[in-house]
Interface confidence: medium
């Protein structure tokens, strides 16, 4: 019968000839009366056999990631008779892995959106690297993820690549972050190879800012000849939020005279001061009103940011008109 052990050849061997093992018949008494032959894909080009001893050699550098096993056939012939000593047999040469491939992130570019002020632990995105080395061969393809850039706002779970928030972020201070993740094979041990990827994390707006008046005091004038409904001027608040979170409504907080009103221009987000009833210079030549501004949409959970609406004082001077 045939005698052999399992055949392994390390990939990427630089030697011109690397001994893999020996194929022999148990009928071979070592007197060189048998001839061994190798057949199949790779026979003669990648692998050769010593016809007398049955020793098998690899004569080419191999790449496991290109081909991880070779199935060959062996024959043994009695030189004197030309007959097969053993039935032809199939055997396998496995290419054993070395750590020659760095981890690669295949789904780049990564981009994620997460609401500002999200609590610690909020999941942002999962990044995954692939390593072409053999996952069953030691730690060559066992990866560990780490954060190269992004502290203290983000963290990455070492074994899963899940990125989480580790510190609250305010979009109004910074609206996007570049996080750099490294994947290292050999679970970080010496000889490890690594790959990196960048993740663009954008913060979406939440309504965490109330509108605030640009000026604490406004002055407007109104002619005593102005009809009711006249727009006498505008006031404006600013809101650091964006979109519908910055939409606001103006209103009168205080006007003992009940002479003025404020309407909101939702296009420009300005407050328009309107004359509600006619004024008379001889009766009163200036007025003071207090206006307030609030956001249009405030979810219940964000009301804590909107206590005490911003107010402004508007001093309105009446202009005299010569009366006939």
């Amino acid at each position: 019968g045939w005698v052999w052990n399992q055949f392994f050849v390390p990939e990427e061997m630089n030697t011109t000839s690397h001994h893999i093992g020996q194929l022999r018949s148990d009928l071979d008494n070592g007197n060189n009366s048998f001839q061994y032959k190798l057949l199949g894909a790779g026979a003669g080009s990648t692998f050769i056999i010593d016809e007398r001893t049955g020793d098998i050699y690899a004569i080419q550098k191999l790449d496991r990631e290109e081909r991880s096993l070779y199935i060959l056939r062996a024959q043994v012939i009695d030189i004197a008779t030309g007959r097969a000593v053993e039935p032809e047999s199939e055997f396998v040469i496995k290419v054993s892995d070395i750590n020659d491939n760095e981890p690669k992130f295949l789904d780049e570019p990564y981009e994620a959106i997460v609401p500002e002020m999200s609590p610690e632990g909020t999941l942002v995105i999962q990044v995954t690297a692939s390593d072409a080395d053999d996952p069953s061969s030691g730690n060559n393809a066992r990866l560990l993820y780490s954060l190269l850039q992004g502290q203290p706002y983000f963290s990455v779970e070492p074994t899963t690549g899940v990125i989480r928030i580790s510190s609250k972020m305010d979009r109004e201070l910074q609206d996007e972050y570049w996080v750099i993740i490294q994947a290292k094979d050999m679970i970080g041990q010496p000889g490890a190879l690594s790959g990196t990827t960048s993740v663009l994390i954008k913060l979406s707006d939440v309504n965490d800012n109330k509108p605030i008046f640009k000026e604490s005091l406004y002055r407007l004038t109104v002619s005593e000849s102005a009809p009711t409904g006249t727009s006498i001027g505008t006031i404006m608040a600013y809101d650091n939020d964006i979109g519908e979170n910055a939409e606001m409504d103006y209103s009168i907080e205080e006007d003992d005279s009940q002479t003025f009103d404020i309407i909101t221009n939702h296009e420009t987000q300005e407050g328009i001061v309107i004359l509600k009833k006619k004024v008379d210079f001889e009766h009163q030549n200036h007025y003071g009103i207090r206006a307030k501004v609030k956001n249009h949409h405030v979810p219940e959970q964000l009301m804590k940011y909107h206590t005490e609406a911003s107010t402004t004082f508007i001093k309105i001077q009446v202009e005299d008109v010569d009366e006939p």
Epitope: L217, D256, H286, K315
Partner: antibody
């Protein structure tokens, strides 16, 4: 004649208090909004506070809000500025000034009173 | 807050010469809401011009104001000895702020 005369200035330690007065004469005091404006030594003018003709509205510069209080007594034609928690940077000549009826610029000023805050 | 910047800081001129003082605002000021004041040493400020170009009561016509938007000018056509003083611009359209002053001194 038409005039404003300030009084009540002096030297005070940081954290201390002073009350300035401004006596008006020669015009209808109760018809005018009144202001305090200050001038630090060798510096420019800085508006401090305003009070409406009837005392109904008051407003303050950010630098003094919460520490200074403007008030008036129309029956005595007098404007006041109560200054608490004084700071070294409050050292200045304090002027009272009248706002015009048709606008909000100052058409009449007093000669000023010097407030020195020093330890 | 509207910031007013006056230039030059000091103007050295002789009596009889023309003085041109500039006041620039950090944002547009309605011309109705700009005033100029004169302050002589040891005295209170005195209103010269309001509404950018209207002379206050009792102010000689050698003083004139002009400008709009963010650039305003006070002109003294022929300097008299009593005109050597510090001049301040003030906006009163949105709260009250003053420029840092221009000193007109005798050359």
């Amino acid at each position: 004649q038409v005039q404003l005369v300030e009084s009540g200035g002096g030297v005070v330690q940081p954290g201390g208090s002073l009350r300035l007065s401004c006596a008006a004469s020669g015009f209808s005091f109760s018809s005018y909004d009144m202001d305090w404006v200050r001038q630090a030594p060798g510096k420019g003018l800085e508006w401090v506070a305003v009070i409406w003709y009837d005392g109904s509205n008051k407003y303050y510069a950010d630098s003094v809000r919460g520490r200074f209080t403007i008030s008036r007594d129309n029956s005595k034609n007098t404007l006041f500025l109560q200054m608490n928690s004084l700071r070294v940077e409050d050292t200045a000549v304090y002027y009272c000034a009248r706002e015009t009826g048709e606008g909000w610029y100052f058409d009449l000023w007093g000669r000023g009173t010097l407030v020195t805050v020093s330890s | 807050e509207i910031v007013l910047t006056q230039s030059p800081g000091t103007l050295s001129l002789s009596p009889g010469e023309r003085a041109t003082l500039s006041c620039r605002a950090s944002q547009s000021v309605s011309s109705s809401y700009l005033a100029w004041y004169q302050q002589r040493p040891g005295q209170a400020p005195r209103l010269l011009i309001y509404g950018a170009s209207s002379r206050a009561t009792g102010i000689p016509d050698r003083f004139s104001g002009s400008g709009s938007g963010t650039d305003f000018t006070l002109t003294i056509s022929s300097l008299e000895p009593e005109d050597f003083a510090v001049y301040y611009c003030q906006q009163y359209g949105s709260s009250w702020t003053f420029g840092q002053g221009t000193k007109v001194e005798i050359k």
